[in-house]
Interface confidence: low
């Protein structure tokens, strides 16, 4: 169980000439109010399919009335979150369908008009429980900016919110800030709250409290860019001052990045990051537009046509980069569960699953009890996509279809006579031993050595074991 | 720093195929996708020339005129490796062929310049006999 939430930053009219000014039809003032729709995979679905993942409706946004004279603004829009619950399990993969719903508030016979202004689709990966995706689309003459997550409610746990923890009352062998999970009691899942401060754009933590840093951050939370800190070069001696290794002489030293290009160090070299409209070793190439197409991964670039306008690459998330060209290492993040080995190849993540486990992300547990029934009265315990029958007492087999003697494996101790019985077995103890295996001396006072007897038991009468 | 390999090369009759490979080693897989890749060939008293490239992040490919329709460039991002397909060989494509690569990405019309790229393999010898 979750919820799959969208927030709108904002909606107006897109970059270049031939923008629409405004979404009202001449007749009047009009609002604006958005739909987000559902659908589980990544196939392009027709239009018309259902939000079998769900869909939600906005309020409507304040009323907007065209100024003639003003420049086109970002349009009101409504307030708050977009929420779509889901019951059932997470998919991962989905399409997100969003539309712009127009409603035109002029003198209509039978009140208000409603037509269509845009919509966007976007088929997208997505762990729940990550953090915020951005993203920027363009639909016609419209650009929609806006952010989407999914996260888990209630116990649900994991990328797909598929494995429920349950609170227990006694103490955790987990430690602190650790919480059991359930079925699997030994696997410990901590709640993703970092280090108070810890950046959310740069930083993340797998464990309460901690603030790890994606490559190109440093500092206590991944705040300060690693290009400027002085902590970052370990060559050279310690600055008593700062505490810090001082940095000798590296290949960034001069800046060898032309027109405002800033350097990073690679082992043995440097890198050079170029502003727009640059590029090269050195960014000494200059005159790129957006005829060049020079916005990667499904950046969207905006600017003019001619050499010496420069250009923006709005880039999808999960990208940046002055033309959407880099991706932090999303294995980093350890995004596959259960042990499954990550592979970022670029244009997809992928995980390679231990056996027993499957899913995008390695998160479900392969049930080999589905459509299995343990017979009699067995019950049937799922491991690491091996099926096996726990029996009830007094059969046996893959199955639990086999009848066992329960007294084959001579349970009672200490020369305890056994007795098959309906409900299991029972233990006729020899005098001077007591309990269910007759496995409790009794001393000569009449006091077992261990726990006393259940009351209407005195120690040598036969106990059923249940 | 960025090590390539190339391997592949040999003697073939013209009209025949071979496909070159270059491995990129010392590198992040996670990353490889970051580097824009070219192959280049320089013929005994010639200048180097691109034959054929492949853009970071869009995966953009360009070709020289002269091997259009005869070389395909391509990337297996799980094996951090570039390929060339060459078909059709020909007596004029007799040249050492060098894998090259550069961190981030090259605009796709300038992708055959040589003096854009970074790191450089020690070449694979094609030699076509008529």
């Known amino acids: 169980a979750g919820v799959f939430e969208l927030q709108i930053h904002s909606f107006g009219p897109g970059p270049g000439p031939g923008a629409p000014r405004s979404p009202c039809s001449a007749r009047g003032p009009c609002r604006l109010f958005f739909r987000v729709c559902l659908k589980p995979g990544l196939s392009e679905e027709a239009a018309e399919s259902p939000c079998a993942l769900g869909a939600a409706l906005s309020a409507r946004g304040p009323v907007y009335t065209e100024q003639p004279e003003a420049p086109a603004p970002d349009l009101p829009l409504p307030n708050g979150l977009l929420q779509v619950p889901f019951r059932d399990a997470w998919p991962g993969t989905f399409s997100l369908i969003i539309e712009t719903w127009r409603e035109e508030l002029g003198d209509q016979i039978g009140g208000p008009a409603w037509s269509l202004l845009a919509r966007v689709t976007r088929r997208r990966r997505l762990a729940a429980g990550g953090p915020w995706a951005r993203d920027i689309q363009r639909a016609g003459a419209w650009e929609l900016r806006f952010s989407y997550r999914a996260r888990c409610e209630l116990l649900a746990v994991g990328t797909a919110c598929t494995r429920l923890c349950r609170p227990r009352s006694a103490p955790s062998r987990c430690g602190p800030g650790l919480r059991p999970c359930a079925p699997l009691e030994d696997e410990c899942e901590a709640p993703p709250v970092c280090r108070a401060g810890c950046s959310l754009e740069h930083g993340f933590c797998e464990q309460p409290g901690e603030c790890r840093c994606l490559e190109g951050w440093t500092g206590p939370l991944c705040t300060v860019p690693a290009s400027t800190s002085s902590c970052l070069g370990l060559r050279g001696p310690s600055s008593a001052t700062t505490g810090c290794l001082v940095p000798g002489p590296g290949p960034c030293d001069g800046n060898p990045c032309a027109n405002g290009g800033s350097c990073s160090e690679t082992p043995g070299s440097f890198e050079c990051t170029c502003p727009r409209g640059f590029y090269g070793l050195r960014c000494e190439v200059s005159g790129v537009t957006c005829a060049d197409g020079p916005c990667f991964n499904g950046g969207l670039c905006v600017g003019g046509a001619d050499p010496d306008s420069a250009y923006i690459c709005h880039c999808p998330p999960g990208f940046q980069g002055s033309n959407c060209e880099k991706r932090v290492d999303r294995c980093s993040l350890q995004p596959c569960r259960n042990g499954g080995l990550c592979l970022d190849l670029g244009h997809a993540l992928r995980c390679r699953c231990r056996a027993g486990f499957a899913g995008p992300r390695c998160e479900h547990n392969l049930d080999d009890c589905a459509g299995r029934a343990c017979a009699n009265g067995g019950t049937c315990v799922e491991g690491g996509g091996a099926h096996r029958c726990s029996c009830a007492l007094g059969f046996g087999g893959r199955d639990c279809r086999e009848r066992a003697d329960p007294c084959a494996a001579r349970p009672c101790a200490h020369g305890g006579r056994c007795y098959a019985h309906f409900s299991g077995l029972v233990c006729a103890c020899a005098p001077g031993y007591m309990g269910s295996r007759c496995e409790f001396p009794v001393h000569p006072d009449g006091v077992s050595a261990l726990p006393a007897a259940p009351p209407g038991l005195r120690p040598g009468d036969p106990q059923r074991y249940l | 720093q960025v090590q390539l390999a190339e391997s592949g090369g040999g003697s073939v009759q013209a009209g025949g195929s071979l496909r070159l490979s270059c491995v990129a080693s010392?590198?992040?897989?996670?990353?490889?996708?970051?580097?824009?890749m070219a192959w280049f060939r320089q013929a005994p008293g010639k200048e180097r020339e691109g034959v054929a490239a492949?853009?970071?992040?869009?995966?953009?490919?360009s070709y020289a005129d002269s091997v259009k329709d005869r070389f395909t460039i391509s990337k297996d991002y799980a094996n951090n490796t570039l390929y060339l397909h060459i078909n059709n060989l020909k007596p004029e494509d007799t040249a050492m062929y060098y894998c090259?690569?550069?961190?981030?990405?090259?605009?796709?019309?300038?992708?055959?310049?040589?003096?854009?790229?970074?790191?450089w393999g020690q070449g694979t010898q094609v030699t076509v006999s008529s």
């Open positions: 090259a690569a550069a961190s981030g990405w090259i605009v796709p019309s300038r992708s055959l310049t040589a003096n854009l790229y970074r790191y």
């Open positions: 010392g590198y992040p897989s996670s990353t490889y996708y970051m580097l824009s």
């Open positions: 492949i853009t970071s992040g869009t995966g953009s490919t």
